[in-house]
């Protein structure tokens, strides 16, 4: 026994109290308008297709259609009793894209096409997306339209992010094979590109691929190995999209940042996060070579986006993604450091000579704060009990620091009898002194280390 469908609607005249399926008339195998329930809600009948008459004696509309009388009033038992006929109209009025790659004016037309397809023993047509095929859903009031600010940034900056590939020669055949790849970003319309120095390390041919797939041979214009910044150049006719450098000194902890790179041809990789730690002040941003602070972020920086830009929500570059990771933390070279490098590079090329020598010991470090110390202590049980000093992220091989015995994860707490509270203190002493007698906290030991800075070309 079937209970009648649509019990809340007024009963049509002459409907039985109970539905009896045996009394339902046989139905054709295929219905043009799809199936529907009869006026009593007892039997499945062929519904009228879109545009067909409904109400009165014509019967119900098919699936997804409603019976609308002139002036757009939906038909009801009351209307039917007044003996007014309506038309079957699709309840959904927006276009849809079908799996057959056709755009349908509405869902009902797609369903009708699907029924025709099945009748011909072809696959049914299903809905792939709202809106026309090949066209995005552009509803300005949708949440994804309003709140996808990260995607907006990526869309804005992606054309200026490039894929860099390095080639080496085989020793005897001299055939070139790809050896490594990374990312970079365009900083001038005529083709200057910034990347990590480690991306374009020596003895390699460098090829750059733009977002549009165009490839160019690049020339290495300038490299600061210690700061891990390189400037390369491609020859391109016409103007290239560029990224502007923001002020890393104005970054605030908690700011949203986006790390973008181009690890494969024509493809970007995007990670996002916040700034965990910024430099401790404008003065520390002028640090010499690699003895400098980094921007720390929880945006994942990996081989895919190394050399690419770390940007703020305005699409300004606030750092270069660099690979060095300590205790699950990612680092970026601050944009103020990039500006300095670009300015000095410009001067060097304009004057055709090197500027004054710099003193260098060969460490990458960051200022230790109590919160940073706590974070590192949580990650490493044996991290020293210190709340300030210069935390060594990396000791560069074959440098005075390595020769003197400095190690990764050491914390410099004093030099030449003066306490060290930040990375800036270390850089200041390096500039002034020819010998550095350091006290370093390693685990829970204090170790005396002597480092002799070397003079290098900038």
């Amino acid at each position: 026994q079937l209970s009648r469908a649509g019990r809340s609607a007024p009963l049509a005249a002459g409907c039985p109290d109970r539905c009896e399926p045996a009394r339902c008339p046989p139905q054709p195998e295929h219905c043009e308008g799809g199936r529907a329930r009869d006026a009593c809600g007892c039997c499945e009948v062929c519904g009228a297709p879109e545009g067909a008459a409904c109400g009165l004696q014509e019967g119900p509309c098919g699936e997804g259609l409603q019976c609308v009388v002139p002036f757009g009033v939906p038909a009801s038992a009351t209307v039917r009793r007044r003996a007014q006929a309506g038309l079957c109209v699709c309840a959904s009025s927006e276009p849809v894209c079908g799996s057959d790659a056709n755009t349908y004016a509405n869902l009902c037309q797609l369903r009708a096409a699907s029924r025709r397809s099945e009748r011909l023993h072809r696959p049914p047509v299903i809905v792939l997306q709202r809106g026309a095929c090949g066209q995005g859903q552009e509803d300005p009031n949708s949440l994804r339209h309003k709140y996808n600010f990260i995607a907006d940034v990526v869309e804005k900056i992606a054309p200026a992010v490039v894929h860099i590939e390095l080639f080496r020669k085989l020793p005897f055949s001299k055939r070139e094979v790809p050896v490594a790849s990374g990312s970079g970003f365009i900083v001038s319309e005529d083709g200057l590109i910034v990347t990590n120095a480690h991306v374009v390390t020596n003895k390699h041919r460098v090829k750059v691929e733009l977002k549009n797939g165009a490839t160019y041979e690049a020339k290495i214009k300038d490299v600061d190995e210690k700061a891990d910044i390189a400037l390369i150049k491609i020859d391109h006719q016409g103007k290239l999209p560029v990224l502007l450098l923001g002020r890393s000194s104005e970054l605030r902890p908690g700011e949203f940042v986006v790390a973008i790179g181009s690890p494969f041809s024509l493809q970007n990789t995007v990670t996002t996060g916040i700034v965990s730690t910024t430099q401790r002040g404008g003065k520390e941003l002028g640090l010499r070579n690699s003895d400098m602070d980094y921007i720390q972020t929880d945006a994942i920086i990996n081989y895919g986006n190394s050399g690419g830009p770390l940007v703020n929500l305005d699409g300004e570059v606030i750092g270069i993604n660099t690979l060095k990771v300590t205790a699950g933390i990612s680092f970026a070279i601050p944009s103020d450091k990039i500006k300095k490098f670009l300015t000095e590079s410009h001067d060097r090329q304009a004057k055709g000579k090197a500027i004054t020598k710099k003193k260098y010991i060969g460490i990458r470090m960051m200022s230790l704060t109590s919160s940073k110390a706590k974070e590192l202590k949580d990650r490493h049980r044996d991290f020293p009990d210190v709340i300030s000093g210069a935390y060594i992220i990396e000791v560069i091989p074959d440098t005075p620091a390595e020769a003197g015995g400095l190690k990764e994860n050491d914390v410099i707490i004093s030099i030449n009898g003066q306490s060290v509270v930040s990375a800036n203190d270390v850089s200041d002493v390096i500039k002034r002194e020819s010998t550095l007698n350091m006290v370093v906290r390693r685990g829970n030991e204090d170790i005396m280390i002597t480092v002799i800075p070397e003079e290098i070309d900038p």
Partner: antibody, heavy 123, light 105 residues
Framework: QVQLVQSGAEVKKPGASVKVSCKAS????????MHWVRQAPGQRLEWMGA????????AYNQKFKGRVTITADKSASTAYMELSSLRSEDTAVYYC????????????????WGQGTLVTVSS | DIQMTQSPSSLSASVGDRVTITCSVS?????MYWYQQKPGKAPKLLIY???NLASGVPSRFSGSGSGTDFTFTISSLQPEDIATYYC????????FGQGTKLEIK
């Protein structure tokens, strides 16, 4: 992981030829040259020659020129070294070894080696 | 051809000792490479580009030098370090030193 697997030991008569195979796996075979190095009992390692598997281009140590032939089958990721006109002093362990490359310095070395194939030349 | 002279040809040392092997070449080379070979086994790369430690190699091994004179050092000899050590250069083509056989006293 990178592996180089060589064919088994051989005993040959003076004047004969020997062909040793080296099956590579775990990397793109055509991106690295394959080299052959031999070691006679109690002697230093001695470079014999190399092949670029992509092009078939070869380079040989002058000492073996005319007697050694190095070939490669790209489809099988296998390199071969054939040494002809064998003499007793060719009794040695023959190694295939992949040319390694230093990204930082641009230098070349041998980073992966086969297990070695002992070739004994005896009448 | 570049001639390579490795010395000593053999040496005996105690566990914990600092061991040094030298390699001289007849004309200047950019880099030196060092290998360890245990009996019946293929050589294993220890040091590349003169001073860089190959992947998975203990830090007690180190290399230094430039031009024509290069040094390989084991800072604290361990029993498993018993082997023959070879230097190798690669200028026009690769050549190896004659080897240094290291034994435990």
């Amino acid at each position: 992981q990178v592996q180089l697997v060589q064919s088994g030991a051989e005993v040959k008569k003076p004047g004969a030829s020997v062909k040793v195979s080296c099956k590579a796996s775990g990397y793109t075979f055509t991106d690295y040259e394959m080299h052959w190095v031999r070691q006679a009992p109690g002697q230093r390692l001695e470079w014999m020659g190399a092949i670029d598997p992509e092009t078939g281009g070869t380079a040989y140590n002058q000492k073996f020129k005319g007697r050694v032939t190095i070939t490669a089958d790209k489809s099988a990721s296998t390199a071969y070294m054939e040494l002809s006109s064998l003499r007793s002093e060719d009794t040695a362990v023959y190694y295939c070894t992949r040319e390694g490359y230093s990204y930082e310095g641009g230098g070349y070395y041998f980073d992966y080696w086969g297990q070695g194939t002992l070739v004994t030349v005896s009448s | 051809d570049i001639q390579m002279t490795q010395s000593p040809s053999s040496l005996s040392a105690s566990v914990g000792d600092r061991v040094t092997i030298t390699c001289s070449v007849s004309s200047s080379v950019s880099y030196m490479y060092w290998y360890q070979q245990k009996p019946g086994k293929a050589p294993k790369l220890l040091i590349y580009d003169t001073s860089n430690l190959a992947s998975g190699v203990p830090s007690r091994f180190s290399g230094s030098g430039s031009g024509t004179d290069f040094t390989f050092t084991i800072s604290s000899l361990q029993p498993e370090d018993i082997a023959t050590y070879y230097c190798q250069q690669w200028s026009t083509y690769p050549t190896f030193g004659q080897g240094t056989k290291l034994e435990i006293k």
